[in-house]
């Protein structure tokens, strides 16, 4: 007499929600006499999935006609799969007996895992901007996928990054999983136009990974370089002071002119010129009348960029000795 073998050929079955799942089971012998039942799980708390003789299993159909005399195929099909159906399914042979049939042999089991696509990755940057040469963190999140195996890569302007840490939760068995990855990026002054991309590859995506992006422009602050120039005196004792604010980002910038410590003008950057790297330049002029000055004038330009502490740049306008004499005469 040939020893009975219970064959469940698939170790793993991936099924999408709403689909039907076929769980295959064949036996190699008709003996001993007795039914084949399907269970999910093991141990005393296992769940009966199908019993041909008794019970009501509306979502389960048999692949073959179990009433046929020499039937050896006990495969079943479960319709309208839901996340609650995930688990390991066993076909189990029972030997006919009384007062109950006796469990004789179990198949090795088929794990049914839900095939669910990951959500579109969402990349979020740091809460506050940082300046070049500093490191910022970007986080990528995706959820709702199954099975657990997933691949995540980071890119900066198309170049793969290596400094990142990824976690898939939960660690144990679950209906679906989520992934969270944090990449560390060192900022460069030209990164205003740079982009980081998080790429997620999963069995459900048929080789077409999902991507989420974030612009480094949201994370970077390039502080301005400041330059003050003084144009030669014009007729009428006027001096043109030019203040050039170069290579800054973002564009919110406020400039205050102070004459001997007193505010004489405040302006917000408006007509900016954009550089190729995405940073901005801005030029501000101040016309100073020196005819009524008897002492040297200290001109200070105060720049407040993106809410940071103000940066000052001062220039001393020297009044000629002739002017000083004239003004001192006038005061006597």
């Amino acid at each position: 007499e040939e020893e009975l073998q219970m064959i469940q050929p698939e170790k793993l079955l991936l099924v999408a929600v709403g689909e039907s799942a076929t769980l295959n089971c064949t036996v190699t012998s008709l003996l001993p006499v007795g039914p084949v039942l399907w269970f999910r799980g093991v141990g005393p708390g296992r769940e009966l999935i199908y019993n041909q003789k008794e019970g009501h299993f509306p979502r389960v159909t048999t692949v073959s006609d179990l009433t046929k005399r020499n039937n050896m195929d006990f495969s079943i099909r479960i319709s309208s799969i839901t996340p609650a159906d995930a688990g390991t399914y066993y076909c189990v042979k029972f030997r006919k007996g009384s007062p109950e049939n006796v469990e004789f042999k179990s198949g090795p089991g088929t794990e049914m895992a839900l095939r669910a696509k990951p959500s579109a990755p969402v990349v979020s940057g740091p809460a506050a901007r940082a300046t070049p040469e500093h490191t910022v963190s970007f986080t990528c999140k995706s959820h709702g996928f199954s099975p657990r195996d997933i691949t995540l890569k980071w890119f900066k302007n198309g170049n793969e990054l290596s400094d990142f840490q990824t976690n898939v939760d939960p660690a144990g068995q679950s209906v679906s999983y989520s992934i969270r990855s944090t990449a560390r990026v060192v900022l460069a002054p030209w990164d205003v136009r740079s982009q980081v991309t998080c790429e997620v590859a999963h069995v459900t995506l048929q080789g077409d990974p999902l991507r989420g992006t974030a612009n480094l422009s949201e994370a970077i602050r390039v502080p301005p370089t400041l330059e003050v120039t003084q144009q030669p005196m014009r007729a009428g004792n006027q001096v043109n002071i030019t203040y050039q604010v170069r290579n800054f980002y973002p564009q919110n910038l406020q400039l205050t002119w102070l004459e001997n410590g007193n505010v004489c003008r405040t302006e917000t950057a408006s007509t900016l010129t954009e550089n190729k790297d995405g940073t901005y330049n801005w030029t501000s002029w101040l016309l100073v009348n020196t005819s009524d000055q008897r002492d040297d004038v200290v001109l200070t330009c105060q720049v407040k960029h993106d809410g940071q502490l103000a940066v000052n740049k001062s220039l001393v306008l020297e009044v000629s000795a002739h002017q000083k004499d004239q003004s001192s005469d006038a005061t006597h």
Epitope: P44, R46, K96, G97, S98, P99, E100, V102, S106
Partner: antibody, heavy 117, light 107 residues
Amino acid sequence: QVQLVQSGAEVKKPGASVKVSCKASGYTFTSYYMHWVRQAPGQGLEWMGRINPNSGGTKYAQKFQGRVTMTRDTSTSTVYMELSSLRSEDTAVYYCARLGSAYFDLWGRGTLVTVSS
Amino acid sequence: DIQMTQSPSSLSASVGDRVTITCRASQSVDTWLAWYQQKPGKAPKLLIYEASTLESGVPSRFSGSGSGTDFTLTISSLQPEDFATYYCQQANSFPITFGQGTRLEIK
């Protein structure tokens, strides 16, 4: 050969618990349910319950419900029967017996449990 | 629970005699009935199962019959080794139950 080897005789005080073992050999342990039957001195046979060696599922006689626990260790092909809150009426020979389709075709030699103060 | 009643409770007979023991169930057990022989200090030994099937290795002088509620065990010609206690057992439904036993003694 096909046999069931039980643990040795036990003497217990009232209120105590006893755990009897039964080691199967010579056949596929998981293909037969194991039952426990006891016999008080000079009395008949009394069915106590059974264990499914595959799943560990149990079924107990109403009389012993709450006092008896049957377990198994598939790695050693051994089943255990633990009876708690012992009283003098529990003095008996305890047998493990393999159930064929509806009959006990293989028996252990029995374990005498004496409950005495 | 299904009650199993054996009769007689004890009986004396001689070697060579034909002996019949009866077992009555309180409700039908179909043919899910077995007979066992037990000798002092030993475990029971299966003789007959499913009412009439002789267990392998059991002498053919033992036979069983009946279905539903009434069953008999017959020993056609008693041998000295047959003196023992005999039990019937039903396996139609839980709990499994045994008869109280019939003690067969030498006359």
